[in-house]
Interface confidence: low
Amino acid sequence: HHHHHHEQKLISEEDLDLKVEMMARGIQATRLNDSVTISCKVIYSQPLNITSMGITWFRKSLTLDKEVKVFEFFGDHQKAFRPGANVSLWRLKSGDASLKLPGVQLEEAGEYRCEVVVTPLKAQGTVQLKVVASPTSRLFQDQAVVKENEGKYMCESSRFYPKDINITWEKWTQKSPHHVVISENVITGPTIKNMDGTFNITSYLKLNSSQEDPGTVYRCVIRHESLHTPVSIDFILTAPQQSLSEPEKTDIFSSGGGGSAG
């Protein structure tokens, strides 16, 4: 008669334990169009055999209270329901069921759920994915303003997300080593939504150069949760009828990690 070989079980099923560990504090942040790896670690009381386990990733959107399947893997097949979604089978062997999403879009923010099945056990964990976009900012003079000695300066921030942003104007004079926040003659326009869901905003500062000291440094300061620290762009009033003929562009380096990245 035939002997069927079964894998030796070293512990009983009652002693089996399956857990899923997600990102600390249950939140991950990424930048628009970046690749993100959403963490999910499988902790099992036995060595993992990936042919007898299943991983499914779901996403619940911020707007719709509905879950959609993003990726699944079961023993001998895997399927990405979102193009490019992937769980590394090589990493899965050592318990890393993290989901890689290339080119993340704003609408992909939401709650991600990692569900792991090692028969007969099932475990799951959730994490919030936050998608942010850092503003690109520039400072330029409105050439259309033609009143004598009057200049209108524009600080423009574009393609940022989420919507909340803070733009302030400051000045340093040679008389004072400290900056002064300017509140008069400042108008900050409405936030404009772009087709891709990001936002633009422009803040205007009106200056009468005859009343200002040459050498005064003006600064536009942009604060946004995607920025590691506030971004500032300076210009110096050199003489009456100061003109910024070329738009000053600032390449902004901002930290990863997203969040109120203070």
Epitope: T37, S39, H228, G257, G262
Partner: antibody, heavy 117, light 107 residues
Framework: QVQLVQSGAEVKKPGASVKVSCKAS????????MNWMKQAPGQGLEWIGG????????DYNEKFKGKVTMTVDTSTSTVYMELSSLRSEDTAVYYC??????????WGQGTLVTVSS | DIQMTQSPSSLSASVGDRVTITCKAS??????VAWYQQKPGKAPKSLIY???NRYDGVPSRFSGSGSGTDFTLTISSLQPEDFATYFC?????????FGAGTKLEIK
């Protein structure tokens, strides 16, 4: 879970340099900034500076420029802070802190640097 | 630099007391304020971020409030393990700055 493990206490002579390390584990190393804080005996906390862990950027407190250099070895998930031209006022506990979504969410255990002749 | 002025510098209280520590910024820092707890010989522990949000695992008796220039940390009912030094910190602009600390002692 996230862990930041710093190197052990150091005793140095004035004028020497010291390199303190901070090894991170439990998270995607390069997605964060690591900052360093100084706490002199019986004193409050001072921010020294930070390094973006992909090695692309550093931010130093003006007060510590010329005194401190921060580097990162992504292969070992370790951040280093070197203090040069040590003086007695550099005697302090130095902490590395991971800058999470809302600043210093995880801290190393601290490294005591004593400068004494 | 933004100065963070913390008061009181020390405070004696009993288990069960309600305690409030204040922190005043020298200029508007929005809600970009964090609070830390430090026990002797230990690293600071993060309690509060964005002025009023508790980190995971921080007991609900700790609460933060305020915006602009005035901030408070409140411990609603002191427990024996709460006796420590507390620091506030602004992270709206560089250099990041801390309050000098409030030492909370047993009465």
């Amino acid at each position: 879970q996230v862990q930041l493990v710093q190197s052990g206490a150091e005793v140095k002579k004035p004028g020497a340099s010291v390199k303190v390390s901070c090894k991170a584990s439990g998270y995607t190393f390069t997605s964060y900034w690591m900052n360093w804080m100084k706490q002199a005996p019986g004193q409050g906390l001072e921010w020294i500076g930070g390094i973006y862990l992909s090695g692309e950027s550093t931010d130093y407190n003006e007060k510590f420029k010329g005194k401190v250099t921060m580097t990162v070895d992504t292969s070992t998930s370790t951040v280093y802070m070197e203090l040069s031209s040590l003086r007695s006022e550099d005697t302090a506990v130095y902490y590395c802190t991971r800058r999470g979504d809302y600043f210093g969410d995880f801290w190393g255990q601290g490294t005591l640097v004593t400068v004494s002749s | 630099d933004i100065q963070m002025t913390q008061s009181p510098s020390s405070l004696s209280a009993s288990v069960g007391d309600r305690v409030t520590i204040t922190c005043k910024a020298s200029q508007n820092v929005g809600k970009y304020v964090a609070w830390y707890q430090q026990k002797p010989g230990k690293a600071p522990k993060s309690l509060i971020y964005s002025a009023s949000n508790r980190y995971d695992g921080v007991p609900s008796r700790f609460s933060g409030s305020g915006s602009g220039t005035d901030f408070t940390l409140t411990i609603s009912s002191l427990q024996p393990e709460d006796f420590a030094t507390y620091f506030c910190q602004q992270y709206i602009s560089y250099p990041l700055t801390f309050g000098a600390g409030t030492k909370l002692e047993i009465k």
